[in-house]
Amino acid sequence: VPRWRQQWSGPGTTKRFPETVLARCVKYTEIHPEMRHVDCQSVWDAFKGAFISKHPCNITEEDYQPLMKLGTQTVPCNKILLWSRIKDLAHQFTQVQRDMFTLEDTLLGYLADDLTWCGEFNTSKINYQSCPDWRKDCSNNPVSVFWKTVSRRFAEAACDVVHVMLNGSRSKIFDKNSTFGSVEVHNLQPEKVQTLEAWVIHGGREDSRDLCQDPTIKELESIISKRNIQFSCKNIYRPDKFLQCVKNPEDSSCTSEI
């Protein structure tokens, strides 16, 4: 008789999750010489250890510490690009602008990007049927805690001018409840970070509004200023220029070196 299994509201673990994480790790360490020392089997073991046999609503940042330690990576702290609700374009930008980095350009972010995972209390099984939804079930689930942990560390590492790409097509351009709004903003270090520069990406070709005057941007400015970090906002038009570069990343147009 099959054992009763908890039904969660969210999708289950991504199929072939262990193989995917291991393969991504191998690929990443091959491409990035500074991470060649990483033992991907150990990385997988640490990843697995963070959530296997644990109740998927009782995961803590502490559970991920062994993985964080193995995935320790130094990126240029003044070349960090944060993003909110505009992941694809941010990634297209850093594919092209190779000297800037999103969280998903780091090993740990790359391993987990777009994946879902969870286990079950007291069994070594991975749950491929369902995993907790952040809103409907619980916030301390394996995926949410992972991203909260790595996002906090990424923000803490930032220095000088930090850029954040925001989606000007959304009703809330800055959302306090996003990972950027709830974690990264509050973990930028005022003694290291001089300025947060927001890039508000416009969608429409005829759009000539000043979205830097949006109330949610004013809210972001207020939060940042109270943390003694300078704030700057720029309207960015013609995002099709980014897309062209993704198709032809070697092209000379796809670099800010003028």
């Epitope: 005829e206 000539s208 830097c212 099709d240 062209q244 147009s253 800010s256």
Partner: antibody
Framework: QVQLVESGGGLVQPGGSLRLSCAAS????????MNWVRQAPGKGLEWVSA????????YYADSVKGRFTISRDNSKNTLYLQMNSLRAEDTAVYYC?????????????WGQGTLVTVSS | DIELTQPPSVSVAPGQTARISCSGD??????VYWYQQKPGQAPVLVIY???KRPSGIPERFSGSNSGNTATLTISGTQAEDEADYYC??????????FGGGTKLTVL
């Protein structure tokens, strides 16, 4: 190195037409927005028109909208400006200019310009 | 549409610092570009993205942008810097605008 060479300027009567060309070399033409900027004698710079990489999006200054048409032929690395219903105030040196990449919208390179004189 | 206002002329002694201003409503919300134009020549980009220098432009050229004003600063101005300078910004759609230009005279 990047080169932009304009041609097609000259003397034309008010109400007449002219077609300017800009031959581009030294870069991947189809990867950039391209622009026309003009400068009346003794005056400042005025942006005229822009066209996206594949020509599917065009922009015009109010002063030329409905009279000028920008186009490009990526197979020939050439930018065009068809100017109809020309007026005396269109008299200027017309520059072809290549856009900056990514988040920037300015002009990295300029041609030497071609003079358009509208006079009877 | 944003309007960019520049002083018609600025004078500076050789070796001194020249500052050319460019003002417009909430200009800080847009990237600003600066061009140098010498008589009979095409403009040349000297600053892009508020403060970045293209390769080949001397270090004495710098830019800033805050509040409603962008500034082009030329430190240790040389005779060869005498030219017209134009600021430019883009505010979306068909709103690409230049300032009226500033004639820099090196005394």
């Amino acid at each position: 190195q990047v080169q932009l060479v304009e041609s097609g300027g000259g003397l034309v009567q008010p109400g007449g037409s002219l077609r300017l060309s800009c031959a581009a070399s030294g870069f991947t033409f189809s990867s950039y927005y391209m622009n026309w900027v003009r400068q009346a004698p003794g005056k400042g710079l005025e942006w005229v028109s822009a066209i996206s990489m594949h020509g599917d999006t065009t922009y015009y200054a109010d002063s030329v909208k409905g009279r000028f048409t920008i186009s490009r032929d990526n197979s020939k690395n050439t930018l065009y400006l068809q100017m109809n219903s020309l007026r005396a105030e269109d008299t200027a040196v017309y520059y072809c200019a290549r856009d900056l990449p990514l988040v920037y919208t300015g002009f990295a390179y300029w041609g030497q310009g071609t003079l358009v004189t509208v006079s009877s | 549409d944003i309007e960019l206002t520049q002083p018609p002329s600025v004078s500076v002694a050789p070796g001194q610092t020249a500052r050319i201003s460019c003002s417009g409503d909430n200009l800080r919300h847009y990237y600003v570009y600066w061009y140098q134009q010498k008589p009979g020549q095409a403009p040349v980009l000297v600053i892009y993205g508020d403060s970045k220098r293209p390769s080949g432009i001397p270090e004495r050229f710098s830019g800033s942008n805050s509040g409603n004003t962008a500034t082009l600063t030329i430190s240790g101005t040389q005779a060869e810097d005498e030219a017209d300078y134009y600021c430019q910004t883009y505010t979306g759609g068909a709103s690409l605008v230049f300032g009226g230009g500033t004639k820099l005279t090196v005394l």
